[in-house]
């Protein structure tokens, strides 16, 4: 057992990268990091589990963009990212570091997360060694970090496979060396097969020589897949540098925990029993207790190493560990040229003028998709539409009950009465017309226009 440790030194625009922060026009935000460790150097599917483990950093300090200011290195979370591993350290591994931004502004729905950068490195690393530094570019971003793997007592060695056993004596006896940091813990290093590479091999039993991943041969001197004689097997020939017939890669069964070995060109493959993973079945089963589901994924099953777990991912994430962000905007949900905004928990479509609806599917300028309520009719014209409302109704969709008298349509002190089909004006003495707009001369004749026959001054005038 042991711990992989990652220290982020800086994250910011690389040389020739973004001259301005990509945070412009956004509110305050803060960074956090996620690290994922996978055993082996092989190109793995993006959604394959972080079988060696994973960790999430704390949130960094809140950062607010200064408009027009050059983008500085961004404030980082405090502390190391630590990924505990159980059993052996594989020696070769894939390291995935994701830089996430959490926006804290007034955007709808609270904080929103977006992936700023993702770097993947395939590395060889012995446990117990010094910090290894690295600088990686991801687009316009540059990430500087260091990492190391260290064993946790009583495990020691380059693969954390040898165990320190406590000794009763306060000083170590002959042939025993101290297991730092405690003087009264000592280990007897197993005597490996003569000539076994100190750098690329290890042993748990005397006379054994087991290779770290990426190395092969009886003495672990031959890098996997680098020889020009991969069809042959055996120790390296001193004359040609090629392999000569000898022990096969499955000799001595390099597969741990009951795994079965089968030969592949120049190497071997372990078929692991349920609950074990890794090139040599050295990684024990991941359970829900290990927290394998990221980004708020819900882990079900996997109560013990022999039962599989399943991550139920929250919206916006997928993959067996919810480690892959879904780009739902790539599905082009926004219609009619709408702009898609992925808020993580939801999408937002910002519609062009003339369109509306959750996905801009509603054409506001189209009577076909437009309904005018209460018997109103839709009238198109000039690239737009309007509702011609039935009497007694108004508003954009004719949904509002109109008060025909609200606008005081009756002139010269006439009284307005609402009528089921409109309004009626009862004119004051001396006036007539639909809106009492015409004064009546003393001889009973209106000025303009002529009153319809049968109407006397003061009669109610109906206004259609």
């Amino acid at each position: 057992a042991g711990v992989f440790e990652l220290q982020i030194h800086s994250f910011g625009p690389g040389p020739g990268g973004a001259p301005r922060s990509p945070y412009s026009a956004r509110g305050p935000c803060r960074l956090f990091f996620r690290v994922c460790l996978k055993p082996g150097l092989s190109e793995e599917a993006a959604e394959s589990p972080c079988a060696l483990g994973a960790a999430l950093s704390a949130r960094g300090p809140v950062y607010t963009e200064q408009p027009e200011a050059p983008a500085p290195d961004l404030p980082l979370p405090n502390g190391l990212l630590q990924v505990p591993f159980r059993d052996a350290w594989p020696g070769t591994f894939s390291l995935i570091i994701e830089t996430w931004r959490e926006e804290l502004g007034d955007q709808i729905g609270g904080p929103a997360w977006s992936l700023l950068a993702r770097v993947t490195r395939r590395r060889r690393l012995a446990a117990g060694g010094p910090w290894a530094g690295d600088i990686q570019r991801a687009g316009a971003w540059e990430l500087r970090f260091s990492y190391r793997a260290r064993c946790e007592l009583p495990a020691v060695g380059t693969a954390c496979t040898r165990l320190c056993r406590p000794r009763s004596a306060s000083r170590c006896g002959p042939g025993l060396r101290p297991c730092a940091p405690l003087e009264d813990e000592c280990e007897a290093p197993p005597v490996c097969r003569a000539g076994c590479s100190l750098e690329h091999g290890f042993c748990e039993q005397p006379g054994e020589c087991r290779c770290l991943e990426g190395w092969t041969g009886p003495l672990c001197m031959v890098p996997v897949s680098t020889s020009s004689c991969l069809g042959l097997r055996g120790p390296s020939s001193t004359t040609t540098g090629c392999l000569v017939p000898g022990p096969g890669p499955c000799d001595g069964n390099p597969c741990a925990n009951g795994g079965s070995c089968s030969e592949t060109p120049g190497s071997f493959e372990c078929t692991c029993p349920r609950g074990f993973y890794g090139l040599r079945c050295e990684v024990s089963g991941v359970t829900c207790a290990d927290g394998p589901c990221f980004n708020g994924g819900l882990c079900v099953g996997g109560a013990d190493p022999d039962s599989a777990y399943i991550c139920h991912c929250p919206p916006g994430f997928q993959g067996s560990n919810c480690e892959k962000r879904v780009d739902r905007c790539s599905l082009q949900p926004c219609r009619n040229g709408g702009l898609c905004l992925d808020l993580g928990h939801a999408l937002r479509c910002r519609c062009r003028a003339g369109f509306a609806g959750p996905r801009c599917e509603h054409d506001l300028n189209d009577c076909a998709g437009r309904a005018c309520a209460n018997g109103g009719t839709c009238v198109e014209g000039g690239g737009a539409h309007r509702c011609s409302c039935a009497l007694g109704f108004g508003g954009r969709d004719c949904r509002e009950r109109a008060d025909p008298c609200a606008a005081r349509p009756c002139a010269h002190g006439g009284r307005c009465y609402a009528h089921f089909s409109g309004l009626v004006c009862a004119c004051a003495p001396g006036y007539m017309g639909a809106r009492c707009e015409f004064p009546v001369h003393p001889d009973g004749v209106s000025a303009l226009p002529a009153a319809p026959p049968g109407l006397r001054p003061g009669d109610p005038q109906r206004y259609p």
């Epitope: 709808i108 729905g109 599905l331 949900p333 808020l343 609806g357 599917e361």
Partner: antibody, heavy 118, light 107 residues
Framework: EVQLVESGGGLVQPGGSQRLSCAAS????????MNWVRQAPGKGLEWVAN????????YYVDSVKGRFTISRDNAKNSLYLQMNSLRAEDTAVYYC???????????WGQGTLVTVSS | DIQMSQSPSSLSASVGDRVTITCRAS??????LAWFQQKPGKAPKSLIY???SLQSGVPSKFSGSGSGTDFTLAISSLQPEDFATYYC?????????FGQGTTLEIK
């Protein structure tokens, strides 16, 4: 956990009114369009209405226009459907459903039954 | 309004079978199609959106395909819990409309 709980169903006479409510929890209600969908007994699903996050846009199926009104109260995390001039054909289980943006209905309530009968 | 028609309206199958349900739109709807599962007395459950994208938490035994007017839902290795009614639904334009449903029964 996302939860939508409808209430307000019951027996109502033709021409009568009923107000349905949907209480939302487990998510930021004010960030989502919301929908009402109904299902007549033994029949299929029919979308009824939806409303924008801030209530500024509302859309209805033709058969309920002018009779039903969808509304929301973001402070109370609640969605409403005011149903007037009810008809026998409005008898159905009414579901509220959330629209996350990529498709209309990702989470549904358990439904509330409205029966229009004399 | 866009009409959605599903076929067959009912289907009998055995545990372990693979089945397909088809859905046809009366006019082109691009990939603006969703599939839902409903069990008696329960609310519908979202399975697939954008014609082929699996909703979060839905097992990969469900898959969707198609574009334009013709769409398919496939369910592999049927289990007892998969026997239910399945609906397709278009969200290309208002009003959103559903197919009439396909009832999947155990043989």
């Amino acid at each position: 956990e996302v939860q939508l709980v409808e209430s307000g169903g019951g027996l109502v006479q033709p021409g009568g009114s009923q107000r349905l409510s949907c209480a939302a929890s487990g998510f930021t209600f004010s960030s989502y369009w919301m929908n009402w969908v109904r299902q007549a007994p033994g029949k299929g699903l029919e979308w009824v209405a939806n409303i924008k996050e801030d209530g500024s846009e509302k859309y209805y199926v033709d058969s309920v226009k002018g009779r039903f009104t969808i509304s929301r109260d973001n402070a109370k995390n609640s969605l409403y459907l005011q149903m007037n001039s009810l008809r026998a054909e409005d008898t159905a289980v009414y579901y509220c459903a959330r629209d996350p943006g990529w498709a209309p209905f990702d989470y549904w309530g358990q439904g509330t039954l409205v029966t229009v009968s004399s | 309004d866009i009409q959605m028609s599903q076929s067959p309206s009912s289907l009998s199958a055995s545990v372990g079978d693979r089945v397909t349900i088809t859905c046809r739109a009366s006019q082109g709807i691009s990939n603006y199609l969703a599939w839902f599962q409903q069990k008696p007395g329960k609310a519908p459950k979202s399975l697939i959106y954008a014609a082929s994208s699996l909703q979060s938490g839905v097992p990969s035994k469900f898959s969707g395909s198609g574009s334009g007017t013709d769409f398919t839902l496939a369910i592999s290795s049927l289990q007892p819990e998969d026997f239910a009614t399945y609906y397709c639904q278009q969200y290309n334009s208002f009003p959103y409309t559903f197919g009439q449903g396909t009832t999947l029964e155990i043989k």
